[in-house]
Amino acid sequence: YDFTNCDFQKIEADYLRTISKDLITYMSGTKSTDFNNTVSCSNRPHCLTEIQSLTFNPTPRCASLAKEMFARKTKATLALWCPGYSETQINATQAMKKARKSKVTTNKCLEQVSQLLGLWRRFIRTLLKKQ
């Protein structure tokens, strides 16, 4: 999906109002220094591409974050503010819902969510630079 035509201001508002709180709740008990940020992004569409990938694409050591509250809110936000996102992406993530068996917050998942927080912060920074 090409995130170029998204309403970035509205996405930022949703992130600051609600998604960020859920990400921080997920990370509770860990320190910001526990993980190194290895994933980066260069502009707003690129940041959203990386956020989409890290949130919804399962990895071997963190099967799926897609059922977490922050992920559901991310999906809702992208559906609202990125025209065409729903049609191209929602069906693709339904299979991941089914793949998830039990809710286990592994260290790898915490690391992945730490990367997500970094990407979101980068998204906000690139937004501020443009204004």
Partner: antibody, heavy 120, light 111 residues
Framework: QVQLVQSGAEVKKPGSSVKVSCKAS????????ISWVRQAPGQGLEWLGV????????IYAEKFQGRVTITADTSTSTAYMELSSLRSEDTAVYYC?????????????WGQGTLVTVSS | QSALTQPPSASGSPGQSVTISCTGT?????????VSWYQQHPGKAPKLMIY???KRPSGVPDRFSGSKSGNTASLTVSGLQAEDEADYYC???????????FGGGTKLTVL
């Protein structure tokens, strides 16, 4: 069962406000969009706005901006639509409608409608 | 933010096919595949018949079909039946600011 149940008919004076409720049951309220659509007597459908409780987003039709307020109480699975500064042209049946999960612009479930009459 | 344009009326005999058009702009119908159609019988709430311009929700007969070309969407009802007599409304997503637009409605009469 899966349904939206709206509050009863209202008669209001011009200049006053009306608040209509819409109670959801049989589905996860917060995940869907709840839109409000009105229909004046003998007229077509007109969209007023939507709320997506999951992310606390509301979007209003430009025509009603500043006059309509849509809220939701997830603890009771109830959405509300308040319209202020009522005039006779606001006499209509007001429907709440469920927007599909992540496809908030398709209304696959409707309330029974609430008739709001504005008359002096 | 004007409504989508539909013919006020359409008619057909039982067993025939009838097509209702809905014309918008490149900012709504032409810009997205997010067109839906609703059926409304007198005194009743609308019912979703078509979404994503050509998909049918479960329970909607396959006599109802949707299509789209450019800025115009169409609803075709084939094998008309008496119970198809109703008002039909098209709707389109219209971007993140306007969100949803409805057509003025078409009264379908089964002769």
């Amino acid at each position: 069962q899966v349904q939206l149940v709206q509050s009863g008919a209202e008669v209001k004076k011009p200049g006053s406000s009306v608040k209509v409720s819409c109670k959801a049951s049989g589905f996860t309220f917060g995940s869907y969009g709840i839109s409000w659509v009105r229909q004046a007597p003998g007229q077509g459908l007109e969209w007023l706005g939507v709320i997506v409780p999951l992310v606390g987003v509301t979007i209003y039709a430009e025509k009603f901006q500043g006059r309509v307020t849509i809220t939701a109480d997830t603890s009771t699975s109830t959405a509300y639509m308040e319209l202020s500064s009522l005039r006779s042209e606001d006499t209509a049946v007001y429907y709440c409608a469920r927007g599909q999960e992540y496809f908030y612009w398709y209304f696959d479930l409707w309330g029974q409608g609430t008739l709001v009459t504005v008359s002096s | 933010q004007s409504a989508l344009t539909q013919p006020p009326s359409a008619s057909g005999s039982p067993g025939q096919s009838v097509t209702i058009s809905c014309t918008g702009t490149s900012s709504d119908i032409g810009g997205y595949n997010r067109v839906s159609w609703y059926q409304q019988h007198p005194g009743k709430a609308p019912k979703l018949m078509i979404y994503e311009f050509n998909k049918r929700p479960s329970g909607v007969p396959d006599r109802f079909s949707g299509s789209k070309s450019g800025n115009t969407a169409s609803l075709t009802v084939s094998g008309l039946q008496a119970e198809d007599e109703a008002d039909y409304y098209c709707s389109s997503y219209a971007g993140t600011d306007i969100f949803v637009l409805f057509g003025g409605g078409t009264k379908l009469t089964v002769l």
